[in-house]
Interface confidence: medium
């Protein structure tokens, strides 16, 4: 979570909430009483912008959080990496059947980069996200935070960009990091032929044909 963020060379980042300077300013619905942007400090006293919600005592929760518009840069399939911490309902005092331990991830393709409102029916569900058994422990100053990491992919995409949304249905959760990226095959030289950076196809297994060129001082 902390320190410089170095990602594999074949991954191109479209959104990294940890790289945003200042407030993220994503859109929440309802405006109050649902997701809230909260700054926490890591062990190096660096602020981490997180979104959290913890309405575990109230029934029928439906709290939405939407990112800003994300350009797809020609990618047909994108990957969403979410780092989050989710409280175990059994660890909370007094909670009954209202407490949940999952949240939902959605996306909505759009050519409009300035949509102001969340229209729930426009969003397509990607998956229900639960806390995995495996987690990393992160020091956030005066206590250790259990950090789960989940990666989902979505595609094929066709519009200029898209929005991501997170739906809370009554969990005690903090989104600590959201990263969206696509994968590419990096520039490759084979047998004096050079093949450029190439974005992967719509499916994880699809082959993309790309025209190469001769390296300098060589001919076809």
């Amino acid at each position: 979570v902390t320190g410089s963020r170095v990602y594999p060379a074949n991954e191109v980042t479209l959104l990294d909430s940890r790289s945003v300077q200042g407030e993220l300013g994503w859109i929440a619905s309802p405006l109050e009483g649902g997701w809230e942007e909260v700054s926490i400090m890591d062990e190096k006293n660096t602020p981490i912008r997180t979104y959290q919600v913890c309405n575990v005592m109230e029934p029928s929760q439906n709290n939405w959080l939407r990112t800003d518009w994300i350009t797809r840069e020609g990618a047909q399939r994108v990957y969403i990496e979410i780092k989050f911490t989710l409280r175990d309902c059994n660890s909370l005092p007094g909670v009954m059947g209202t407490c949940k331990e999952t949240f939902n991830l959605y996306y909505y393709e759009s050519d409009n980069d300035k949509e102001r409102f969340i229209r729930e029916n426009q969003f397509v569900k990607i998956d229900t996200i639960a806390a995995d058994e495996s987690f990393t422990q992160v020091d956030i100053g005066d206590r250790i935070m259990k950090l789960n990491t989940e990666i989902r992919d979505v595609g094929p995409l066709s519009k200029k960009g898209f929005y991501l949304a997170f739906q809370d249905v009554g969990a005690c959760i903090a989104l600590v990091s959201v990263r969206v990226f696509y994968k590419k095959c990096p520039l490759t030289v084979r047998n004096l032929a050079q093949f450029p950076d190439t974005i992967t196809g719509a499916d994880t297994s699809s082959l993309v044909e790309v025209r190469g060129s001769c390296v300098n001082n060589s001919e076809e």
Epitope: E32, G33, I40, Q52, C54, N55, V56, M57, E58, P59, Q61, T85, R87, L92, P93, G94, M96, I140, R143, M145, C172, I173, A174
Partner: antibody, heavy 125, light 107 residues
Framework: QVQLKQSGPSLVQPSQSLSITCTVS????????VHWVRQSPGKGLEWLGV???????DYNAAFMSRLSITKDNSKSQVFFKMNSLQADDTAIYYC???????????????????WGQGTSVTVSS | DIQMTQSPSSLSASLGERVSLTCRAS??????LSWLQQKPDGTIKRLIY???TLDSGVPKRFSGSRSGSDYSLTISSLESEDFADYYC?????????FGAGTKLELK
């Protein structure tokens, strides 16, 4: 700073209802719930109920049939109403702010961190 | 309902003295306990939450601790403004329940 100011009658006739208003400042009712507690010489402190920040309520089963807690977020007011009062409902009634439960810190939902000044209510004819 | 048994019900002590009050929970409350102070005018103030965490602005002479199902509030050196009624509150489960209180008086 956080304040809870209560207003309501000091005398209620038997079988009548009690209405108390808790007007809050220094925090928003859309972010914090408000609890109600009473204190009587015979039974000590008793938790009556709570209205959560989303507007849903939870009541002590012993009072559920005659208790109603509502609020007006825009006016920062919480309304407490108890019906069919009898002499043993004579008590000091308090509203108290919920200490928000966090993802990282166990502040505890019910651990009321700020209290109103109390409304002393006598049930008598 | 969880019963909170508080002792002693009253306590006479002198200025500068160290005193301890105890609450015992009838069921497991996992440290979800607060200590409250009530002054003679009826004003209630929270001193401690989560069994041992001091509220901001509360003097360091107040401390909370836990030993199994027993929870204690200790005042290390009594000052004149500490003479009041003290209550424990469990917030582990519905309904929330309080101890019967301890009246701390000047000897």
């Amino acid at each position: 700073q956080v304040q809870l100011k209560q207003s309501g009658p000091s005398l209620v006739q038997p079988s009548q209802s009690l209405s108390i208003t808790c007007t809050v400042s220094g925090f928003s009712l859309t972010r914090y719930g408000v609890h109600w507690v009473r204190q009587s010489p015979g039974k000590g402190l008793e938790w009556l109920g709570v209205i959560w920040r989303g507007g849903s309520t939870d009541y002590n089963a012993a009072f559920m049939s005659r208790l109603s807690i509502t609020k007006d977020n825009s006016k920062s007011q919480v309304f407490f109403k108890m019906n069919s009062l009898q002499a043993d409902d004579t008590a000091i009634y308090y509203c108290a702010k919920e200490s928000l439960f966090g993802v990282y810190y166990d502040y505890g939902y019910y651990s009321m961190d700020y209290w109103g000044q109390g409304t002393s209510v006598t049930v008598s004819s | 309902d969880i019963q909170m048994t508080q002792s002693p019900s009253s306590l006479s002590a002198s200025l500068g003295e160290r005193v301890s009050l105890t609450c015992r929970a009838s069921q497991e409350i996992s440290g979800y306990l607060s200590w409250l102070q009530q002054k003679p005018d009826g004003t209630i103030k929270r001193l401690i939450y989560a069994a041992s965490t001091l509220d901001s602005g509360v003097p360091k002479r107040f401390s909370g601790s836990r030993s199994g199902s027993d929870y204690s509030l200790t005042i290390s050196s009594l000052e004149s403004e500490d003479f009041a009624d003290y209550y424990c509150l469990q917030y582990a489960s519905y309904p929330l329940t309080f101890g019967a209180g301890t009246k701390l008086e000047l000897k």
